[in-house]
Interface confidence: low
């Protein structure tokens, strides 16, 4: 039994501090007590802490830790969430413009093919949007369907406009002939190659960004173990039990504790680094036929060329098809009846190239540069959190978990902790199931990113498992987005003008007093915050 404390040795300071954590003083002793029931802040003498206080300190310590982790990841989380939304929207806008350019090409050059062509073009670009967002659609089928649908209209409206209505029954025959006679030359094949390569890469890029968000969200909301809670309590609060209110934990001690608490999280580091580097490799290869902006915005030109190719061969085609499809009601069309490769386009086809000053590719590179500054995010977390919580500089006159020391010694601290619990054991437990799951997902996306990276390897036709979403932002009035020039061709302007659509904001003063749950750590992309702020790739 320790001797009673001198009359002036009260727990007044501890009481006033604890009241800020927990209103009411029923748990705080008025004068120091033996504290034999304490399990974390094991006393060397009389203490101003009770078991109930200790429990409250543990809860507060774990909450503090969660908040520190969330504020540590705030900037990174905001960067990825904002960019995922911006790129997704930008890709949808590219699709919308590509559709509008294609519709305008038909309207200006082949007015007799509208509105059927608009319908087929609309369906094609809806499929493009769905594909980008993960829907299980085959790109070759999309392109084939576009040309299969267009050819009967081209044949009946442009090549043989005098056909009676009853002859419209030949549509199925014409669809079949389209492929077997290669009526569009190699243009459909060219479009398949360009579109599939560029869309696969775009899709994996979006999928990777969405997974990045999931990684941050997972680690952002980790619940720390009781062991970690005890370590944090000992570091941040046990000094109060001895009346040492102004003492800060030793920096070295903080690092040891944080490494213990975050051992599982730090295991993500290797895969996170690989994720950023693989994403960089993907982005570096997203040009020419691997750049959906370049490919889709040039499609109108390739489709135009393909129709001109048909027109050039109209004479031979009309004769051949006239014979083949004249009695299509009587007999089924059979590809075996017709010579293969009747009209093969021998000339080398150039990729339609759209000139513009600045494109999404520069935005992607900008994002990668910013992401690379977070490449050590997970390995640096313990140090970051210690540097953003109160610690004593130079490890002098600081708290080591048990007492005030003049200089921190890791060995002494470890020895002192042995009876309480083993730091090494905490590290050995391995990552939590949610962390293991996110590591598996990172491994999977890294594998995908590696197989998709250009130009080293071929783009594999992977069926990615992200779900699809219809773009839905397409105005069907093509004149709203683009005007045809006098000669019937379309001038493609700097594409960043349409990205301006993404930068509009909903002014915060539109929502007076609307601050529920809006803490500084919540600075993510939001309908109620200016998208053009902070890390906006539109600035």
């Amino acid at each position: 039994q320790p001797p009673p404390p001198p009359p002036d040795a009260t727990c007044h300071q501890v009481r006033s501090f604890f009241q800020r954590l927990q209103p009411g003083l029923k748990w705080v002793p008025e004068t120091p007590v033996p504290g034999s029931d304490l399990q974390v802040c094991l006393p060397k003498g009389p203490t101003c802490c009770s078991r109930k206080m200790e429990e409250k300190y543990q809860l507060t310590a774990r909450l503090n830790m969660e908040q520190l982790l969330q504020s540590a990841s705030m900037e990174l989380k905001f960067l990825i969430i904002q960019n995922a939304a911006v790129f997704q929207e930008a890709f949808e806008i590219v699709v919308r413009h590509a559709k509008n350019y294609t519709n305008a090409m038909f309207k200006n050059n082949y007015p007799s093919l509208t509105p059927q062509a608009f319908e087929f073009v609309g369906e094609f670009f809806t499929d493009v949007s769905l594909y980008i967002l993960g829907s299980d659609i085959n790109v070759d089928d999309m392109v084939n369907e576009l040309f299969d649908s267009l050819f009967p209209v081209i044949y009946t409206q442009l090549m043989n406009p005098g056909l009676p209505d009853s002859a419209l029954d030949i549509n199925e025959c014409l669809r079949g002939a389209r492929r077997d006679l290669k009526v569009f030359g190699n243009f459909p094949k060219l479009i398949m190659t360009q579109v599939s390569k560029s869309l696969q890469v775009t899709r994996i890029f979006l999928q990777a960004l969405n997974l990045g968000i999931e990684v941050i969200n997972t680690t952002d909301h980790l619940k720390f173990s009781k062991d970690c809670g005890r370590m944090l309590t000992r570091m941040w609060y046990c000094s109060y039990c001895q009346g040492l209110m102004m003492v800060k934990p030793c920096g070295g001690y903080c690092n040891v504790v944080m490494q213990g608490c975050m051992a599982g999280v730090v295991e993500i580091d290797k895969y996170w680094r690989e994720y950023i580097l693989s994403l960089e490799e993907l982005v570096n290869g997203m040009y020419r036929i691997y750049d959906m902006e370049n490919v889709l915005l040039g499609l109108f030109s390739t489709i135009h060329d393909s129709i001109q190719y048909v027109q050039k061969n109209a004479g031979k085609l009309t004769t051949t098809i006239g014979k083949l499809c004249a009695h299509s009601q009587q007999r089924q069309y059979r590809s075996a009846y017709y010579p293969e490769d009747l009209f093969i386009d021998k000339k080398v086809l150039k990729v339609a190239h759209v000139e513009h000053e600045e494109t999404l590719s520069s935005r992607r590179r900008e994002l990668i540069q910013k992401l690379k500054s977070f490449i050590s995010f997970y390995s640096a977390l313990p140090g970051y959190i210690c540097s953003h919580s109160p610690v004593a500089e130079n490890d002098t006159l600081c708290w080591n978990g048990q007492e005030l020391v003049e200089r921190y010694s890791q060995k002494a601290a470890r020895n002192g902790m042995k009876n309480q619990f083993n730091l090494h054991e905490l590290k050995m437990k391995g990552p939590e199931p949610v962390v293991s799951q996110i590591i598996d997902k990172l491994k999977h996306i890294n594998q995908l990113l590696r197989t998709m990276s250009m130009p080293k390897g071929r783009v594999l036709d992977k069926n990615l498992d992200e779900e699809g979403f219809e773009s839905g932002d397409c105005g069907d009035d093509e004149d709203e987005c683009i005007g045809g020039s006098g000669d019937g061709m379309i001038k493609v302007k700097n594409q960043l003008r349409f990205l301006a659509e993404l930068a509009y904001d909903l002014d915060v003063d539109d929502a007076p007093g609307n601050s529920q749950q809006a803490t500084p750590k919540d600075n993510e992309i939001s309908t109620f915050h200016n998208l053009g702020n902070v890390h906006s790739p539109l600035k």
Partner: antibody
Framework: EVQLVESGGGLVKPGGSLKLSCAAS????????MSWVRQTPEKRLEWVAY????????YYPDSVKGRFTISRDNAKNTLYLQMSSLKSEDTAMYYC?????????????WGQGTLVTVSA | DVVMTQTPLSLPVSLGDQASISCRSS???????????LHWYLQKPGQSPKLLIY???NRFSGVPDRFSGSGSGTDFTLKISRVEAEDLGVYFC?????????FGGGTKLEIK
């Protein structure tokens, strides 16, 4: 195909609580702001809650502020609306709706709705 | 809050006729960024609302071209060039220029 499926509606007494859920599929849920919109028996539509893509920012009109809480679980692709201190004027069909990806969005897709009846 | 007023409350039409619905806001819907966030939704009997037109005149994907939107400032109109049976239902206008977003009271399009 985009799908939003609400559940959790039912009959509740004034002052009671109810939690609605909305399961989303067919789109990248994690990058979309989401809302709850209700339709009164008189068929008037009222926007009752908004939550940003990552779940950090929320908004409520004065009529429900302090009583309703919107939340989301991006891992489960699910949106929630916790309603407490319910009043008879909260009786309505509750729809969850995805905002377009653009800021100041419009409600691009709606669920089929779940009916909440507040009555003694 | 911005009040959205729709007229008429009910609109009886014959199939094939043109229909016109008006929507007026209590304050201008032109945002400081120049955009006007006025949208139209259709709710068919027994269904949830569906987006038809966004930002005054842009048709949402899959919406037939017989639907068109126009207007500026505080006065807006939805026109259906040739009403078809599938167009029947309640039409709502909505604004998202000002927080909170608000809806009009609805216009019921029905067969004469």
């Amino acid at each position: 195909e985009v799908q939003l499926v609400e559940s959790g509606g039912g009959l509740v007494k004034p002052g009671g609580s109810l939690k609605l859920s909305c399961a989303a599929s067919g789109f990248a849920f994690i990058t979309y702001g989401m809302s709850w919109v209700r339709q009164t028996p008189e068929k008037r539509l009222e926007w009752v809650a908004y939550i940003s893509s990552g779940g950090a920012n929320t908004y409520y009109p004065d009529s429900v502020k302090g009583r309703f809480t919107i939340s989301r679980d991006n891992a489960k692709n699910t949106l929630y609306l916790q309603m407490s201190s319910l009043k008879s004027e909260d009786t309505a069909m509750y729809y969850c709706a995805s905002l377009s990806t653009l800021v100041r969005g419009w409600f691009a897709y709606w669920g089929q709705g779940t009916l909440v009846t507040v009555s003694a | 809050d911005v009040v959205m007023t729709q007229t008429p409350l009910s609109l009886p039409v014959s199939l094939g006729d043109q229909a016109s619905i008006s929507c007026r806001s209590s304050q201008s819907l032109v945002h400081s960024n120049g955009n006007t966030y006025l949208h139209w939704y259709l709710q068919k009997p027994g269904q949830s609302p569906k987006l038809l037109i966004y930002k005054v005149s842009n048709r949402f994907s899959g919406v037939p071209d017989r639907f068109s939107g126009s207007g500026s400032g505080t006065d807006f109109t939805l026109k259906i060039s040739r009403v078809e049976a599938e167009d029947l239902g309640v039409y709502f206008c909505s604004q998202s220029t000002h927080v909170p977003y608000t809806f009009g009271g609805g216009t019921k399009l029905e067969i004469k």
